[in-house]
Interface confidence: low
């Protein structure tokens, strides 16, 4: 027989199928030009010493063979003795190690069997009613196809699925979408309506994330507030990456889970922007404010579950940084300015009350005054900090108030609102004899003492009603008792106590009269 023809004789090896798992498979035969044809197949197993024979049986029952040698591809013309206009059955027999291995048969009409390509270009993936929809442009001159898909997860083998017949210049497929695991898909096509036509190769992998991105498992820590009024948020534990099917490992196209950090600044609610979303890799600096931090995982199908943490406010206070002057027109605060053109947010809330009761005010951008101070003033009518109680004040600063991560804490301190000098007057002043020339003066703590750092000292005044001489005695803010010595028996005295702040003298308590009785010796 000539090598270009199909040989209608018995093949040169015994007819004995070994039944082994290895051997030829995936036989595909196509017309590749007006008069030429090609069959190709794959061989599984050791290839040394293997000879391949393409077998063909015509509808008449006559059979022939082509000897391909060690090649797994063979071309022939329409003059090779194989009927191309009628149905033929083809298979491959491989002779190796004194045994024959056979491929599955394909039955087809060669003339109408066109080599079909898998989806070649961009494959669009979208979610449709809980399923996955893939769409692609039909390869040139190949309208009319059956399409199959296969898919696998990291822990499961390939499963085959059917996309149904396609008859348009775009083709699509509805596939199952996994809730919690990534999938790898491949697609293949074959000619529609051509009985026994061969499947194309499988397409390149299409990697699909799970419908729900994995919940991020991360931990944060926050550093101490620095001199600049900012503290760094650091990530203690990176989020775990998604497990991927074999064909998606490495580049993992399409299965990426992106983690974003959403910051919500709870303090200073009057600022323009309260939330900011950042890449997880770019850990921000925060002011000393309270924040909620959420880590949001998302993939191409949208956001998944998130994890939220609360970062409490830094309550370290600066008792001396703030000056407050109370006048008839209102109150003015002064503090060391940060820089030129800074916007300040002043936040205050009654001590011991829920954080939701915080009030704040945003200043217009301001430059330092000649003394290097920034100021904020309010009138009595505004009602701000008007009640006679202790307030916790925090001042934040930013040159870019619209950028959440550029705020810094200037200071945190306590302030007693309303008419502090009157409200702070000590009550229940009492005098007890202590010795022949001294008395003990006691009083109830001033309301100012409920406000950390506000009460600077008590002053006790003693007046000799005879000589009109007055003496004043400073007392530590933590003390509510003092001993007055060097008093004379039989003289009338009055005693008063006041409570002073760093910027305000208190109002004297009601005068308390006393005298030390003259001791008569027997």
């Amino acid at each position: 027989c000539r090598t270009s023809e199909c040989c209608f004789q018995d093949p040169p090896y015994p007819d004995a199928d070994s039944g082994s798992a290895s051997g030829p498979r995936d036989l595909r035969c196509y017309r590749i030009s007006s008069d030429r044809y090609e069959c190709s197949w794959q061989y599984e197993g050791p290839t040394a010493g293997v000879s391949h024979f393409l077998r063909c049986c015509l509808s008449s029952g006559r059979c022939c063979y082509f000897a391909a040698g060690s090649a797994t591809r063979l071309q022939f013309s329409d003059q090779a003795g194989v009927s191309v206009l009628y149905t033929v059955t083809l298979w491959v027999e491989s002779w190796a190690r004194n045994q024959t291995e056979k491929s599955p048969e394909v039955t087809l009409q060669l003339y109408n069997s066109v080599k079909y390509e898998p989806p070649l270009g961009d494959i669009k993936v979208s979610k449709l009613a809980g399923q996955l929809r893939m769409e692609w442009e039909t390869p040139d001159n190949q309208v009319g196809a059956e399409v199959q898909f296969r898919h696998r997860t990291p822990s499961s083998p390939w499963k085959l699925g059917d996309c149904g017949p396609q008859d348009d210049d775009t083709e699509s497929c509805l596939c199952p979408l996994e809730m919690n695991v990534a999938q790898e898909f491949q697609l293949r096509r074959r000619q529609l309506g051509s009985q026994g036509s061969s499947w194309s190769k499988w397409s390149s992998p299409v990697c699909v994330p799970p419908e729900n991105p994995p919940q991020p498992q991360v931990r944060f820590s926050v550093e101490q507030l620095g001199q600049d009024g900012r503290r760094r948020l650091t990530l203690k534990e990176q989020p775990t990456q998604l497990e991927l099917p074999e064909g998606c490992q490495g580049l993992a196209p399409g299965t990426e889970v992106t983690y974003r950090l959403q910051l919500h600044m709870l303090s200073c609610p009057c600022k323009a922007k309260a939330t900011r979303t950042l890449h997880l890799g770019k850990m921000p600096y925060l002011s000393g404010a309270a924040y909620n931090v959420a880590v949001i995982s998302s993939n191409q199908f949208g956001p998944g579950l998130n994890q939220t943490w609360h970062i409490p406010a830094d309550t370290h206070t600066e008792p001396v940084a703030l000056n407050i002057s109370v006048g008839t027109n209102g109150t003015t605060m002064y503090w060391p300015a940060r820089a030129q053109s800074m916007t300040y947010c002043i936040e205050w809330q009654p001590v011991g009350q829920d954080g939701g009761l915080a009030t704040c005010s945003l200043t217009a951008p301001q430059d330092p005054d000649p003394a290097g101070m920034a100021t904020y003033s309010w009138s009595r009518e505004s009602g701000a900090m008007g009640q006679e109680k202790c307030y916790y004040i925090t001042i934040f600063a930013s040159a870019h108030p619209e950028k959440l991560t550029l705020w810094s804490t200037v200071l945190s301190t306590y302030h007693f609102g309303g008419n502090a000098s009157a409200a702070g007057t000590p009550h229940h002043v009492s005098v007890k004899n202590h010795s022949l020339d001294s008395v003990s003066v006691d009083w109830a703590p001033s309301l100012l003492s409920t406000c950390p750092g506000v009460l600077k000292e008590y002053v006790v005044r003693c007046r000799d009603e005879d000589s009109k001489q007055v003496s004043e005695h400073p007392v530590q803010p933590t003390e509510t008792q003092v001993t007055l010595s060097g008093l004379r028996a039989g003289v009338a005295y009055t005693v008063q106590v006041r409570a002073d702040t760093a910027w305000l003298r208190g109002v004297w308590s009601q005068p308390q009269r006393f005298s030390i009785e003259v001791q008569v010796s027997d």
């Epitope: 961009d122 196209p253 979303t277 998302s298």
Partner: nanobody
């Protein structure tokens, strides 16, 4: 920053077609999902179509329920442009159409950058 400029809006009869374009400049176009959103008078902004960045030979798209099957979103990363092909337009498609860049989500709040918008009016 990303700057976005929309074009292609106008007046069209019901059943007709329009193609909107959105040209992006600035930060790398490929790193953002691009979306078309629309807002009719007195209504909230809603998603029309979104297209994620291309990964290998795959890119990901999604659509709002009311336009699925009629509108097609595509993007040309080489030209930093995203397109919206609108077929079989209906009067209820009348709105200002905005192009946006951001995360691949159907919620318009996830988009950091916005164009000025282009008016599409569909007459019956």
């Amino acid at each position: 920053q990303v700057q976005l400029v929309e074009s292609g809006g106008g007046l069209v009869q019901a059943g007709g077609s329009l193609r909107l374009s959105c040209a992006a400049s600035g930060r790398t176009f490929r790193t953002y999902a691009m979306g078309w959103f629309r807002q009719a008078p007195g209504k909230d902004r809603e998603v029309v179509g979104i297209a994620a960045w291309k990964v290998a030979s795959t890119y990901y798209v999604d659509y709002g329920d009311s336009v699925r099957g009629r509108f097609t979103i595509s993007r040309d990363d080489a030209k930093s442009t995203v397109y919206l092909q609108m077929n079989n337009l209906m009067p209820e498609d009348t709105a200002v159409y905005y192009c946006a860049a951001g995360a691949f989500r159907t919620d318009w709040r996830s988009y950091a950058y916005w164009g000025q918008g282009t008016q599409v009016t569909v007459s019956s």
